[in-house]
Amino acid sequence: VPLSRTVRCTCISISNQPVNPRSLEKLEIIPASQFCPRVEIIATMKKKGEKRCLNPESKAIKNLLKAVSKERSKRSP
């Protein structure tokens, strides 16, 4: 991974593009920290394992987060 101690935040660019929850392998929400002062959302896609940084402020991404948490709550007993 191209990472050095000087890299503070993971995302170089962020995407507003809606993501189909069915095409998601994993959704990571990285809270703000001493290294990166903002929340970062990283979607791992099933196709080729592509990772995409998402815009936490985007309406489409907020809807995605709701859909994913709803799906998780359905699955948990």
Epitope: L3, V7, C9, I12, S13, Q17, R38, E50
Partner: antibody, heavy 124, light 109 residues
Framework: QMQLVESGGGVVQPGRSLRLSCTAS????????MHWVRQAPGKGLEWVAV????????FYVDSVKGRFTISRDNSKNTLYLEMNSLRAEDTAIYYC?????????????????WGQGTTVTVGG | EIVLTQSPGTLSLSPGERATLSCRAS???????LAWYQQKPGQAPRLLIY???SRATGIPDRFSGSGSGTDFTLTISRLEPEDFAVYYC??????????FGPGTKVDIK
């Protein structure tokens, strides 16, 4: 459509300074990392600098460290390259380029939009 | 620092022929970090391939990328007149820096 327009190039004496600008349109500039890439006459491409979408990180090729500064003003949709202590070997076409949507340190989507470049000539 | 080497330096082919361009890295590169660009004289570069094998938006399917580790390939299945240009591979490496190869010129035989 997505467009980048560079300006600020010109002829400058060695040791002097120049500021390049790159104005973006047709996309949400504040969402994308941005790069400067240069091409010396008759030579290949050389990456110069990158800035994260929010300015949080900036990185440079070794040959310009301490002399060049990349910055951005998201309210003006503009990217800058401040070039100090210019040398003859800095003579090149300077392109600004957009980092692809969603790129991060774990996956790279390439430089997907480029300007037409602005020419910097150092020397007489 | 990873160095990229491209071969051949020049490839002389006729329209309709297949072009195979090679990009070799001095150390292993994750395919997630490898891109290819096309540049025509007097024009800015254009992104063709990212992630070693994914075509960028609007790129015709005659362009394909493959490879892993230290060896990557750009293939143009049937050369069109507009494909004669210089092709650069590029990698995103630690620090982070973004290194270009020296380029391969594809010219008309």
């Amino acid at each position: 459509q997505m467009q980048l327009v560079e300006s600020g190039g010109g002829v400058v004496q060695p040791g002097r300074s120049l500021r390049l600008s790159c104005t973006a349109s047709g996309f949400t500039f504040s969402n994308n990392g941005m790069h400067w890439v240069r091409q010396a006459p008759g030579k290949g491409l050389e990456w110069v600098a990158v800035i994260w979408f929010d300015g949080m990180n900036k990185f440079y090729v070794d040959s310009v460290k301490g002399r060049f500064t990349i910055s951005r003003d998201n309210s003006k949709n503009t990217l800058y390259l401040e070039m100090n202590s210019l040398r003859a070997e800095d003579t090149a076409i300077y392109y600004c380029a957009r980092e692809g949507d969603g790129s991060g340190i774990y996956y790279y989507y390439g430089m997907d939009v480029w300007g037409q470049g602005t020419t910097v000539t150092v020397g007489g | 620092e990873i160095v990229l080497t491209q071969s051949p330096g020049t490839l002389s082919l006729s329209p309709g022929e297949r072009a195979t361009l090679s990009c070799r890295a001095s150390q292993s590169v994750s395919s997630s970090y490898l891109a290819w660009y096309q540049q025509k004289p007097g024009q800015a570069p254009r992104l063709l391939i990212y992630g070693a094998s994914s075509r960028a938006t609007g790129i015709p399917d005659r362009f394909s990328g493959s490879g892993s580790g230290t060896d990557f390939t750009l293939t143009i299945s049937r050369l069109e007149p507009e494909d004669f240009a210089v092709y650069y591979c590029q990698q995103y490496g630690s620090s982070p820096i973004f290194t270009f190869g020296p380029g391969t010129k594809v010219d008309i035989k």
